[in-house]
């Protein structure tokens, strides 16, 4: 069961698997959640011990029964991992801790104007896990305003001491706030030299990349595939680092694949969740349980529901045996990866989906789309919202997209003449406008944030954020879409759709059912030729068929231009303007969301 509360003055007895240092019990809980085996923890605050070296210790614990004896101990704080919970989990920790110094390897010292600047420097430094900043009041003159960047092997401090007039905190890479380059390519027939910091077994290069991404020291990796000549190294994932942060040497090696950690990427692809099945493959590890079930999907579900299960192997039933039930072997290991991977065994293996909730919600796979047809089905575009105005009478005003649990991204031009957010209603999870009745629940708008350089749609900056009065609970029919990542600047999107309840032709009315149209992107040069009287800037993106026929139209404004890349949907554009609707050689013009990611993050994370 999910227990989120912390137990003050309680120590959990036994079950120790590791001890780390954390600045707070809350952070200890996050570390426990991300540790492959930790189910419970005990944190020792500064009042709990006479010995300062014991302050801020976070003891990670495991238990077969998922519980441990409780002992009264002043100053101790205990609790449970969030692995048992269904809510989203994030390693992001924006807290700044006053008068604490987190110890690590200090590898960079420089002056900074503020703790925030120091934290940003850490976030944008490939090696930095956490920092300490000496404030203007620090006793030592030469150390005032010094920003120390630090790293450790584990990503957690090697100790935490009280130190007056300093502040300390963590890198915000796990908050998807880094400006570092994000290299998503996986390079075939390539091995990287450089030092190995760890090695694990992985069934493919993408799982290897995900493991690298959430290993604190891994910057890039090399994976030896099943076809690798040296048998003992098959399926071996080597986690690597270097002083520069980049591989020093690329070696051509057949059947090896290499790539980079995605730690600095902004949202966009799942890094914890390994959802694939591996056929004719056995994952070896410590056995938790063996259960007879029907099919490998059922086996994965069983593993996901068993909190200590990390991966599984399903042995299909022999013909007409056991009512078609095969054996489901639930397994675990010290690091969450199989100890060995065997091929050609007839088994079907995979991982728990419990870790999927550590990824950004926007990366979750949605229902397969119905191809063809122009009417959407429920849950097909779960980020699409309908924005209504209640003045003078209630009507659909614009589309919009969920990008966070309190944020809708839409177009600035939608708010022409809108004097107050009080007249706005956001309806989420809606397929048909006819579903909206007097008593239909909606989200009120707390604030409208229009880009301060917006003047009119045709001159750009046609972007706005709506802050909702209450938060959205994500379900299959209402969830966010990923923002594009700076690292995706060179991606060529080929699967793009525009959606909305807008007109189907120039003189029409708002549609009842959410419409969809697959539309190809058009280069800005091509688009500029079609709109000689306008300036098509890099902050705009165009889409449309040369012959016309499919396009966004009145009422679609503010809605998404959604493009699928690497199995994840990205909000590439916001429906903005165009000449007529679906006219020949007049593509639709959309706000290029990629160019506004910093603006969006600045406003939503203020």
């Amino acid at each position: 069961e999910c227990v989120t509360r912390l137990f003050k003055d309680i120590h959990f007895e036994g079950g120790d698997i590791a001890t780390v240092f954390t600045p707070s019990a809350k952070h200890c809980q996050v570390v426990c959640t991300h540790h492959p085996r930790c189910l419970l923890f005990t944190f020792t605050g500064e009042s709990a011990s006479e010995d300062p070296t014991q302050w801020f210790t976070c003891v990670l614990k495991d238990s077969v029964t998922e519980t441990l004896p409780r002992v009264n101990r002043t100053g101790a704080i205990s609790g449970y991992s969030f692995k048992q919970c269904s809510h989203q989990i994030s390693a992001c920790n924006k807290d700044i801790y006053v008068d604490l110094n987190m110890k690590g390897i200090n590898y960079n010292s420089s002056l900074a104007e503020s703790a925030q600047e120091c934290q940003e420097r850490c976030t944008d430094d490939v090696h930095c896990h956490f920092f300490t900043y000496a404030t203007r009041q620090f006793p030592s003159l030469e150390h005032r305003n010094i920003c120390l960047l630090k790293h450790t092997q584990t990503g957690t401090p090697t100790g935490i001491m009280k130190l007056d007039k300093v502040v300390t905190g963590f890198s915000l890479k796990s908050c998807a706030l880094s400006n570092l380059a994000c290299i998503r390519d996986v390079f075939p027939n390539t091995a990287f030299a450089d030092s190995n910091i760890d090695s694990v077994m992985a069934p493919d290069a993408f799982v290897c990349r995900r493991i690298c991404t959430h290993h604190p020291g891994c910057l890039f990796f090399t994976f030896f595939s099943q076809e690798w000549p040296k048998e003992s190294q098959r399926n071996l994932c080597l986690l690597k680092t270097s002083e520069s942060g980049l591989p020093s040497t690329r070696i051509k090696k057949s059947k090896a694949l290499s790539g980079f950690s995605l730690q600095s990427c902004r949202h966009s692809i799942p890094v914890f969740c390994h959802s694939s099945f591996y056929h004719d493959t056995d994952f070896l590890g410590e056995e938790l349980d063996i259960v007879a079930v029907k099919g490998h999907e059922a086996c994965q579900k069983l593993c996901t529901n068993a909190v200590r299960c990390q991966f599984f192997t399903y042995a299909p039933a022999q013909a007409s045996c056991n009512e078609g039930k095969g054996k489901c072997y639930l397994k675990l290991s010290s690091n969450g990866s199989p100890t060995k991977i065997l091929r050609g065994t007839g088994g079907i293996s995979g991982y728990t989906l419990r870790l999927c909730k550590m990824d950004n919600e926007c990366t979750t796979k949605i229902k397969p789309r119905i191809v063809g047809g122009t009417a959407s089905v429920r849950g097909e575009w779960p980020w699409q919202v309908t924005l209504h105005t209640t003045s003078p009478t209630q009507r659909h005003l614009c589309g919009g997209s969920i990008i966070g649990n309190q944020w809708i991204l839409t177009a600035a031009h939608c708010f022409y003449g809108v004097e107050s957010p009080k007249i706005l209603r956001v309806y989420i999870g809606i397929l048909n406008q006819s579903e909206i009745k007097e008593d239909t629940s909606f989200f009120g708008v707390q604030e409208i944030i229009i880009h301060d350089q917006y003047k009119m749609a045709e001159s750009g900056y046609d972007i706005a954020l709506l802050k909702l009065e209450t938060t959205v609970n994500y379900t299959d029919s209402q969830r966010p879409i990923c923002l594009p990542s700076k690292g995706d600047r060179n991606v060529i999107y080929t699967d793009c759709w525009v959606t909305g309840w807008g007109y189907r032709k120039l003189r029409d009315k708002i549609q009842n059912t959410l419409q969809k149209a697959k539309i190809p992107l058009v280069t800005n040069d091509e688009c500029q030729k079609r709109y000689r009287g306008h300036k098509i800037t890099h902050k705009m993106i165009c889409a449309g068929y040369r012959e016309g026929g499919k396009d966004a139209c009145k009422g679609d404004s503010g809605g998404p231009l959604s493009c699928k890349h690497n199995e994840v949907w990205h909000l590439v554009g916001i429906t903005s303007w165009g000449e007529g609707c679906a006219q020949r050689e007049r593509p639709g013009v959309y706000t290029n969301v990629l160019e506004y990611v910093d603006w969006i993050l600045e406003k939503t994370q203020a």
């Epitope: 010292s109 002056l111 620090f138 030592s140 003159l141 030469e142 010094i146």
Partner: antibody, heavy 124, light 107 residues
């Protein structure tokens, strides 16, 4: 062992400039600040300024502002102090001195290693 | 700037005797004070930092005390090699400033 070796004595005419070097060895050059202090004949010590060899940031005493420039070359672990528009009262022994260890935060420190000094004579 | 005043300007002491040197700051420098020893023709040498902490290799006969604006350097039993000029220096605010020095000479 840790040492700072300064360049040799200089004789300059008024209005000229002088550039004194200070080569560090035996420690990580970029991890400590470096101060420049001068001492006129028979006088006390006078602080001129400081440089952080890691980032190259500097802070100068108001008296020398506009006339002094402190630089560093991390490849040779050397700091330089250039004083321009020299006048006779700039005749002094110029010292470089190692300051705080900047890779760790602690409250108190002093200038723990000094160069041998460079005599600069300004005379027409 | 913070003005550092040392007294006396000259102190005549016999070997084996105790010497007490004083340093006053024009405003509080907390414990951000260092003491140096300088012999003729040589560079200064750090004795004490943080008002009372002896630098590496400095004999125990040297001790520092005080905080705020009043500081003292004590040499418990003067040795022949201790006859020199002693400077105090504040590290509390830019610009760093030195006292005028106290010359300890043989009585």
């Amino acid at each position: 062992q840790v040492q700072l070796v300064q360049s040799g004595a200089e004789v300059k005419k008024p209005g000229a400039s002088v550039k004194v070097s200070c080569k560090a060895s035996g420690y990580t050059f970029t991890s400590y600040s470096m101060h420049w202090v001068r001492q006129a004949p028979g006088q006390g010590l006078e602080w001129m300024g400081i440089i952080n060899p890691s980032g190259g940031s500097t802070s100068y005493a108001q008296k020398f502002q506009g006339r002094v420039t402190m630089t560093r070359d991390t490849s040779t672990s050397t700091v330089y102090m250039e004083l321009s528009s020299l006048r006779s009262e700039d005749t002094a022994v110029y010292y470089c001195a190692r300051g705080a260890y900047l890779m760790e935060l602690y409250y108190y420190y002093g200038m723990d290693v000094w160069g041998q000094g460079t005599t600069v004579t300004v005379s027409s | 700037e913070i003005v550092m005043t040392q007294s006396p300007a000259t102190l005549s002491v016999s070997p084996g005797e105790r010497a007490t040197l004083s340093c006053r700051a024009s405003q509080s420098v907390s414990s951000n004070l260092a003491w140096y020893q300088q012999k003729p023709g040589q560079a200064p040498r750090l004795l004490i930092y943080g008002a009372s902490t002896r630098a590496t290799g400095i004999p125990a006969r040297f001790s520092g005390s005080g905080s705020g604006t009043e500081f003292t350097l004590t040499i418990s039993s003067l040795q022949s090699e201790d006859f020199a000029v002693y400077y105090c220096q504040q590290f509390n605010d830019w610009p760093l400033t030195f006292g005028g020095g106290t010359k300890v000479e043989i009585k």
